[in-house]
Amino acid sequence: MKVLQEPTCVSDYMSISTCEWKMNGPTNCSTELRLLYQLVFLLSEAHTCIPENNGGAGCVCHLLMDDVVSADNYTLDLWAGQQLLWKGSFKPSEHVKPRAPGNLTVHTNVSDTLLLTWSNPYPPDNYLYNHLTYAVNIWSENDPADFRIYNVTYLEPSLRIAASTLKSGISYRARVRAWAQCYNTTWSEWSPSTKWHNSYREPFEQH
């Protein structure tokens, strides 16, 4: 039994780091493998993660962490029984993938303005809470070419757009994702999408 693709890990900078790797053949990850992780710190405890299958030869492990600070560094040991398959390290602050925003809502009752709001996925005491910026994706269910991205570079989790920038009388969907420049994070996953019917009063044309 050998590791084909070494574990790569990302942290949500809150409580979970996710490590993925591939074995050289079909593996029952949960029964055959264990990923041990330990904070590099005096008297820290070793913790065990039981991996799950992620495709035939792929494994994924969700490492539970009380919280994360920038100084954290973990040693990682992948074991198959008594055999050490791989040894590495992981610094969560250097591999951050933020949590996805939630509760995306489209408010259509503000004159001819669409107000999109969502929730910051972090509690106020988390460092990322005040460092997230967002991308909002809006697309038409009827027209695949009608696909747009709005970058929200301010901290407030909301976006206002004129309803008239979208076509009237058709359904649209929206989703949002987040990233944090301070830690050069990857983008989060997209939030679940929300759907609304876009309609607005066309202005009378003057002839």
Epitope: F41, L43, S44, E45, V69, D72
Partner: antibody, heavy 118, light 106 residues
């Protein structure tokens, strides 16, 4: 809710023995290292001893080494401190405290008072 | 062992004032930790890894420093902040505490 409850304190004569217990609840006891910390009346805090989650690593302060023995029973969610050859200067409130990986004590018991006096 | 010396021993201030507590180590430490203790109660973790606030600690508290000199600052004292504060090091065994700084109402 995480709880640590110490017991076993009391009055003992110099040279005598006492066994303190710490009952843990509200968390997976076997995942954490636990410490004893004491505080003499009106004085500051003094770290006494540490035991790793699996009992594989144990440390003592020099002031108690050779006289105190720390142990734990993960099946009973319990921590112990066997104190022998007690001295007047061991008089203190003894706290058990849960250790965190980043090096601090995040939960403490309410303490149990040990008085060494003739 | 690493000896931690806190100053001042007592700090007499009024609510709303700024409090600065110092902790000096006899040799360099990686991080400093702070605990708050009120009469008849067990200590509570207050600041960890020099500058991180423990859960539930108000933002008026901050920690700073490196090497041998560390500081706990309370930007504007509230009535519930009057207590004894201990610094502690986790760099080497035995773990040691400072003797404490009592923040009392003037």
């Amino acid at each position: 809710e995480v709880q640590l409850v110490e017991s076993g304190g009391g009055l003992v004569q110099p040279g005598g023995s006492l066994r303190l217990s710490c009952a843990a609840s509200g968390f997976t006891f076997s995942d954490y290292g636990i410490h004893w910390v004491r505080q003499a009346p009106g004085k500051g805090l003094e770290w006494v001893s540490y035991i790793r989650s699996d009992s594989s690593i144990i440390h003592y302060a020099d002031t108690v080494k050779g006289r105190f023995t720390i142990s734990r029973d993960n099946a009973k969610n319990s921590l112990y401190l066997q104190m022998n050859s007690l001295r007047a200067e061991d008089t203190a409130v003894y706290y058990c405290a849960r250790g965190r990986d980043r090096g601090y004590f995040d939960y403490w018991g309410q303490g149990t008072l040990v008085t060494v006096s003739s | 062992e690493i000896v931690l010396t806190q100053s001042p021993a007592t700090l007499s201030l009024s609510p709303g004032e700024r409090a600065t507590l110092s902790c000096s180590a006899s040799s360099s430490v990686s991080y400093m930790y702070w605990y708050q203790q009120k009469p008849g109660q067990a200590p509570r973790p207050w600041i960890y890894l020099t500058s991180n606030l423990a859960s539930g600690v108000p933002a008026r508290f901050s920690g700073s420093g490196s090497g041998t000199d560390f500081t706990l600052t309370i930007s504007s004292l509230e009535p519930e902040d009057f207590a004894v504060y201990y610094c502690q090091q986790w760099t080497s065994i035995p773990f040691t505490f400072g003797q404490g700084t009592k923040v009392e109402i003037k």
